[in-house]
Amino acid sequence: APVRSLNCTLRDSQQKSLVMSGPYELKALHLQGQDMEQQVVFSMSFVQGEESNDKIPVALGLKEKNLYLSCVLKDDKPTLQLESVDPKNYPKKKMEKRFVFNKIEINNKLEFESAQFPNWYISTSQAENMPVFLGGTKGGQDITDFTMQFVSS
């Protein structure tokens, strides 16, 4: 079966929205009113991977852009990046592992764990206007909890 993708936005548990910061980076900041239109709309694809009731493997692309969040080693550290792909081949059901995140729902929050690097999560800083990154700690200063708002195509 072909891969199905649904559009969504994300906010961290402090209600910060995600926006583009240059061509290959996301940052998190509080938005309101008309500024909400700046927030990134993701195309979330349901991809192949280990699955349970609370854990669903997904890929997070930027809507109508050939950019996907991916997890790679940089200087021996798991790092989040926006990676450009060939739009003729993506999205696909069997995404490379660096593109796959385990969407985990715990109580009323979502976490996005890297499939490539277990226990590393999409994270934001407490501070405003800082890059979205891959963090290796939960429950510390950095924020790993999100809510998702699906939006019409």
């Epitope: 079966a1 072909p2 199905r4 993708s5 649904l6 559009n7 969504c8 349901f46 009731n53 609370d54 669903i56 729902e105 715990i106 109580n107 009323n108 929050k109 979502l110 999100f146 809510t147 998702m148 708002q149 699906f150 939006v151 019409s152 195509s153």
Partner: antibody, heavy 119, light 107 residues
């Protein structure tokens, strides 16, 4: 046996508010995504709100966005739909429905509660 | 939004008849289609999902087929309890929309 029982419907004036409830039993409510679907007289079914099992994900179509909110209390096995700024076109039978985990089909529905918006 | 068009909007048939209802979509939804049955004054009930998979407890006289943009629900031998409204729904992209319904009446 899966049971979904809606309540809270009634007559409300345009611009008014109403809160619908759906009491669930016969299954582990906290493990299922839930939705509200409505059916206006003589019209097709319309999906109006979605919430994931833990409440971390939601969806509203443009027709109700900004006016309706969906929530759930997993400890009480109850789903809610808060409807504000109601319009005549919101008049419908409102059903709560249990949904497959990956945002797909509705496998069980309640019997519905009628909401009438009229002055 | 993907538009769903059912045909016919109503039909009259007799017990034992073979009945076919069609659902067309404005875009390719692959096999992401569901069929529901709704009896008067009752809640809809799931009949078929993924275009052709019968839901638990649904009699084998019901079957679904199709993919892409054209789908059919077939009742091989209509029974008295099958007189109802039937709706298709896609779940390929948001919003998941329903067809306008097909009313199956007694001839």
């Amino acid at each position: 046996e899966v049971q979904l029982v809606e309540s809270g419907g009634g007559l409300v004036q345009p611009g008014g508010s109403l809160r619908l409830s759906c009491a669930a039993s016969g299954f582990d409510f906290s493990r299922y995504d839930m939705s509200w679907v409505r059916q206006a007289p003589g019209k097709r079914l319309e999906w109006v709100a979605y919430i994931s099992s833990g409440g971390g994900s939601t969806y509203f179509p443009d027709t109700v966005k900004g006016r309706f909110t969906i929530s759930r209390d997993n400890a009480k096995n109850t789903l809610y739909l808060q409807m504000n700024s109601l319009r005549a076109e919101d008049t419908a039978v409102y059903y709560c429905a249990r949904q497959n985990k990956k945002l797909t089909w509705f496998d069980y529905w309640g019997q519905g509660t009628l909401v009438t918006v009229s002055s | 939004d993907i538009q769903m068009t059912q045909s016919p909007s109503s039909l009259s048939a007799s017990v034992g008849d073979r009945v076919t209802i069609t659902c067309r979509t404005s875009g390719n939804i692959h096999n992401y289609l569901t069929w529901y049955q709704q009896k008067l004054g009752k809640a809809p009930q799931l009949l078929v999902y993924n275009a052709k998979t019968l839901a638990d407890g649904v009699p084998s006289r019901f079957s679904g087929s199709g993919s892409g943009t054209q789908f059919t629900l077939t009742i091989s031998s209509l029974q008295p309890e099958d007189f109802a409204n039937y709706y298709c729904q896609h779940f390929w992209s948001l919003p998941f929309t329903f067809g306008q319904g097909t009313k199956v009446e007694i001839k």
